[in-house]
Interface confidence: low
């Protein structure tokens, strides 16, 4: 008779559901501060008066917004992503900047550059870097189109990142591509300015490779001229890294014990 | 003081090993003929003697190896998935049929059919197909090769399903690809014979597009000559599906409890 | 599956997901996250009622063991499945941060 | 992560995957799975001690969630994190059949 | 099976210096918090100190101002770097893993080595 | 500084007695108390952790308990094996880990 052996394991005790909730609130009270490493509450002496800046703002909702593309977070998680993430975004280099001349005149590609001395500023070591998001606003889209997106890779050569097929909409979407590999290569090396493709994409036969969708800070009509920029909704790199300071405990701790 | 209270909820009691080992064995017990829905292990009077079928073994070991491109089993499981998954095979319809004949001049492409009567038999109801892996042998590869693979659409068009990057390889090595979604499309469908085609990937300017890598089932050389097969180890599709006597019981148990 | 929408609308006593929607200021006396003011934090609670046994008749376990000890562990518990993170706005001196949490939003249980 | 690795070659008290072989003629007295003849089930066993207190000294606690309870659950519990199918064959009758068996091995553990 | 061997110790002059090792094996040593603790002939046992997986130290009150505690997860070993020696450190210096099956316990000395023997004198 | 002070500091028994040693500490440290095992020319051997928790493979005639400030260890059958110097310590926080001066059990 194992009975006593069983009551050893047994997990279907009757539980006060409100000292529950009680523990739950102060474990959640200890998680937040082990996942943010600081010991106490910060300090708000400091904090400046008035309401959140407009581009914190955008930015927090940048980072609550799922978008298309976006996968949901994957479980398990590794060690150092048990800890918060800062997250930072950087806007595409405008496009009346020179190392978009060369790249006019395509109709089935869009580029787009990144200053990596921006990149740099708000991600210092590349092993900070925990995921990077390509973000772009697409606007209506009349049929389906099946685009392609690459990383420009030495003088003239492009490499193949993703693809995705985009569905017909008449409203705006934001969409979103994993490309934390990539800006990862750009941290850890020395270039000024780096930059993706969006192409339509094309099969081996077929002869009708127009990008049709219209990107957010790239004039309609013609692929090539690339004029105006929408203000703060032009392509951006999402980024979600360890600060530095935060990344130094994690140093030797590869296991969690 | 809440020392009851955390007692209560306390999990880390001593726990004897031997009977947790017991309980964990028992358990599975239960759990496998639970997955199997038998209520006690089946029969054995009318086993045949001698070593099981070489085309179950190898149908076995398919299953057992985990092969590039397959991704690890996801969890969490939708509940029809906690019961276990029949596993067939269906290999490519050969080459000698007249299906391939409009498809044999290219360079850039392999094509593979099926019969759909064969895949029918296997799973009779769309609903019961669990996944669909496209298993490819490919042979060496001198250089990395980016390929894509499409479903037969309509009369002469192709529909995109997903790419791959190759890298090279001086052994062979089997490639799957998640075609579960054409599939069940195929099995609600009332067509005899389906394919895929798996083509170098093309790029809007670049004009290299030969297939380089050799897929066994389609001998070397001219990518269009598609003639001798290497016995089983053609292209095939593996099939993981619910039985239909299976399926009954799921039928009006939408939800656990 | 046992998520928020079959739980939070249902009078399960088993394992579910629990609503819990935490409030920074009330529940834990905090002004310094400025965004989001609280968040449904929810958590997992009930039993895994699971009958084992020596005995052969394994007939009258079988039906619970998807609902109550699909992994066959030898004492199942009731644990998250799915988690989402929480992005939040805070100030370190005068400079605002925007850092995002892991796992910190329960949606569905699990027995496990 | 609290896997094969790491916990089939430590002593670790704490919650951890444990070897378990299960020979199924042996452990189950089946003869009716033709192959394989036993698969690594394996377990996940021992505590994820989380001290909860009322008390303000959060700092003593902080280090330990992301060992003990890194979901902040009230009552942290150690339960399978990465699982593997297991593919048999047997009879039903004359005719031999290969099925799937999903989250039948245990790869890793965690609290949660 | 576990093991820490510690070596390093030995006679040394009043105001000098010495760094005592101990070297880990049969388990994960950079996944454990690790111990100094010493005892001086025929009297009791003193903690010294620790340092957690990270590198993160701490340390008796008496000891901050001489004594440096540090880890080489690469090499296996813990370090125990002691300045300006006095008469009154004479004692066997143990090297012990600490423990963690619960929050605070890592400073519960769950494994011991043998010691290495420092003798003070001029 | 918390201080852990034990006692008797000395005590001589006979096989098969019942042998206490207490330990009391300057300040609570809730059940953060172990206990040690001490022979000649040999490391110390943890007993008990978390005031009461009995260490695997320690036999079941060791005992520890009590919380806060007052601990008892406790050997309910003396055993010749059990000859030796006993040390409590407390560990509720970095600041504190101490070590009671030590209690020498011989023989009578």
């Known amino acids: 008779d194992y009975k006593d052996d069983d009551d050893k394991l047994s997990t279907s005790k009757t539980i006060d559901m409100e000292l529950v909730k009680r523990k739950r609130i102060e474990a959640i009270r200890g998680q937040i501060l082990s996942k943010l490493r600081l010991a106490s509450p910060p300090s708000q002496g400091e904090v400046p008066p008035g309401p959140l800046p407009e581009a914190v703002l955008a930015l927090y909702n940048s980072t609550r917004d799922r978008v298309a593309g976006e996968s949901a977070e994957p479980e398990p998680e590794p060690e150092a992503d048990y800890y918060a993430k800062e997250v930072t975004r950087v806007l595409m280099v405008e496009t009346h900047n020179e190392i978009y001349d060369k790249f006019k005149q395509s109709t089935h590609s869009i580029y787009m550059f990144f200053n990596t001395s921006e990149l740099r500023e708000a991600v210092p070591e590349p092993v900070l870097l925990s995921r990077a998001e390509l973000r772009l606003l697409r606007l209506k889209l009349k049929v389906e189109q099946h685009v392609e997106l690459y990383q420009k890779y030495s003088n003239n050569s492009w490499r193949y990142l993703s693809n995705r097929l985009l569905a017909p909409s008449d409203s705006p979407e934001w969409l979103s591509f994993d490309v934390t590999g990539v800006v990862r290569q750009w941290l850890s090396r020395g270039g000024e300015i780096e930059g993706f493709r969006l192409s339509a994409h094309c099969s081996c036969d077929s002869r009708d490779n127009t990008l049709q969708v219209d990107i957010n800070g790239f004039t309609t009509g013609r692929r090539g001229d690339l004029a105006t920029i929408h203000g703060m909704n032009r392509p951006f790199l999402l980024l979600m890294a360890t600060p530095l300071e935060r990344a130094q405990h994690l140093q030797s701790s590869r296991h969690r014990r | 003081d809440y020392k009851d209270d955390d007692d209560k909820l306390s999990t880390s009691k001593t726990i004897d090993m031997e009977l947790v080992k017991r309980k964990r064995i028992e358990a599975i017990r239960g759990q496998i003929l639970s997955k199997l829905r038998l209520a006690s292990p089946p029969s054995q009077g009318e086993v045949p003697p001698g070593p099981l079928p070489e085309a179950v073994l190898a149908l076995y070991n398919s299953t057992r190896d985990r092969v590039a491109g397959e991704s690890a089993e996801p969890e969490p499981e939708p509940e029809a998935d906690y019961y276990a998954k029949e596993v067939t095979r269906v290999l490519m319809v050969e080459t000698h049929n007249e299906i391939y004949d409009k498809f044999k001049q290219s360079t850039h492409s392999i094509y593979m059919f099926f019969n759909t009567s064969e895949l029918r038999e296997a799973v009779p109801e769309p609903v019961l197909l669990s996944r669909a892996e496209l298993r490819l042998l490919r042979l060496k590869l001198k250089v990395e090769q980016h390929v894509e693979l499409y479903q037969k659409y309509s009369n002469n068009s192709w529909r995109y399903l997903s790419n791959r990057l190759l890298a090279p390889s001086d052994s062979p090595e089997w490639l799957s690809f998640d075609v579960t979604g054409v599939v069940r499309q195929w099995l609600s469908r009332g067509g005899e014979i389906e394919g895929f085609r798996l083509s170098a990937h093309c790029s809007c300017d670049s004009r290299d597009n030969t297939l380089q890598v050799d897929i066994n089932g389609f001998t070397t050389g001219r990518r269009g000559d598609l003639a001798t097969i290497h016995g089983m180890n053609r292209p095939f599709l593996l099939l993981m599906a619910t039985p239909l006597e299976r399926a009954q019981h799921l039928q009006s148990s939408r939800h656990r409890r | 599956a046992l998520d928020t929408n079959y739980c939070f609308s249902s009078t399960e006593k088993n394992c579910c997901v629990r609503q819990l929607y935490i409030d920074f200021r009330k529940d834990l006396g905090w002004k310094w996250i400025h965004e989001p003011k609280g968040y449904h934090a929810n958590f997992c609670l009930g039993p895994c009622p699971y009958i084992w046994s020596l005995d052969t008749q394994y007939s009258k376990v079988l039906a619970l063991y998807n609902q109550h000890n699909p992994g066959a562990s030898a004492a199942p518990c009731c644990v998250p499945q799915a988690l989402e993170p929480l992005p939040i706005v805070y100030y370190v001196g005068r400079k605002p941060k925007v850092e995002q949490l892991s796992n910190m939003i329960v949606r569905s249980c699990k027995c496990s | 992560a609290l896997d094969t690795n790491y916990c089939f070659s430590s002593t670790e008290k704490n919650c951890c995957v444990r070897q378990l072989y299960i020979d199924f003629r042996k452990d189950l007295g089946w003869k009716w799975i033709h192959e394989p003849k036993g698969y690594h089930a394996n377990f996940c066993l021992g505590p994820c001690p989380y001290i909860w207190s009322l008390d303000t000294q959060y700092s003593k606690v902080l280090a330990l969630y992301n060992q003990h309870n890194p979901g902040a659950s009230a009552a942290p519990c150690c339960v399978p994190q990465a699982l593997e199918p297991l593919p048999i064959v047997y009879y039903v009758g004359r005719k031999p059949k290969v099925e799937q068996l999903s989250n039948m091995i245990v790869r890793s553990c965690k609290c949660s | 099976q576990v093991q820490l061997v510690e070596s390093g110790g030995g006679v040394v002059q009043p105001g000098r210096s010495l760094r005592l090792s101990c070297a880990a094996s049969?388990?994960?040593?950079?996944?454990?918090?690790m111990n100094w603790i010493r005892q001086p002939p025929g009297k009791g046992l003193e903690w010294i100190g620790y340092i957690y997986t990270s590198g993160t130290t701490y340390r008796s009150n008496w000891a901050r101002g001489r004594f440096t505690i540090s880890r080489d997860n690469s090499k296996n070993t813990l370090y125990l770097q002691m300045n300006s020696l006095r008469a009154e450190d004479t004692a066997v210096y143990y090297c012990?893993?600490?423990?963690?099956?619960?929050?605070?316990?890592?400073?519960?000395?769950?494994?011991w080595g043998q010691g290495t023997l420092v003798t003070v004198s001029s | 500084d918390i201080q852990m002070t034990q006692s008797p500091s000395s005590l001589s028994a006979s096989v098969g007695d019942r042998v206490t040693i207490t330990c009391q500490a300057s300040q609570s440290i809730s059940t953060y108390e172990a206990w040690y095992q001490q022979k000649p020319g040999q490391p110390p051997k943890l007993l008990i952790y978390a005031a009461s928790t009995l260490e695997s493979g320690v036999p079941s005639r060791f005992s520890g308990s009590g919380s806060g400030t007052d601990f008892t260890l406790t050997i309910s059958s003396l055993q010749p094996e059990d000859f030796a110097t006993y040390y409590c310590?407390?560990?509720?926080?970095?600041?504190?880990?101490?070590f009671g001066q030590g209690t020498k059990v011989e023989i009578k």
């Open positions: 049969g388990f994960h040593f950079s996944n454990e918090a």
């Open positions: 012990a893993r600490g423990w963690h099956i619960f929050g605070h316990q890592y400073w519960v000395m769950h494994f």
């Open positions: 310590q407390s560990y509720s926080d970095g600041d504190s880990v101490k």
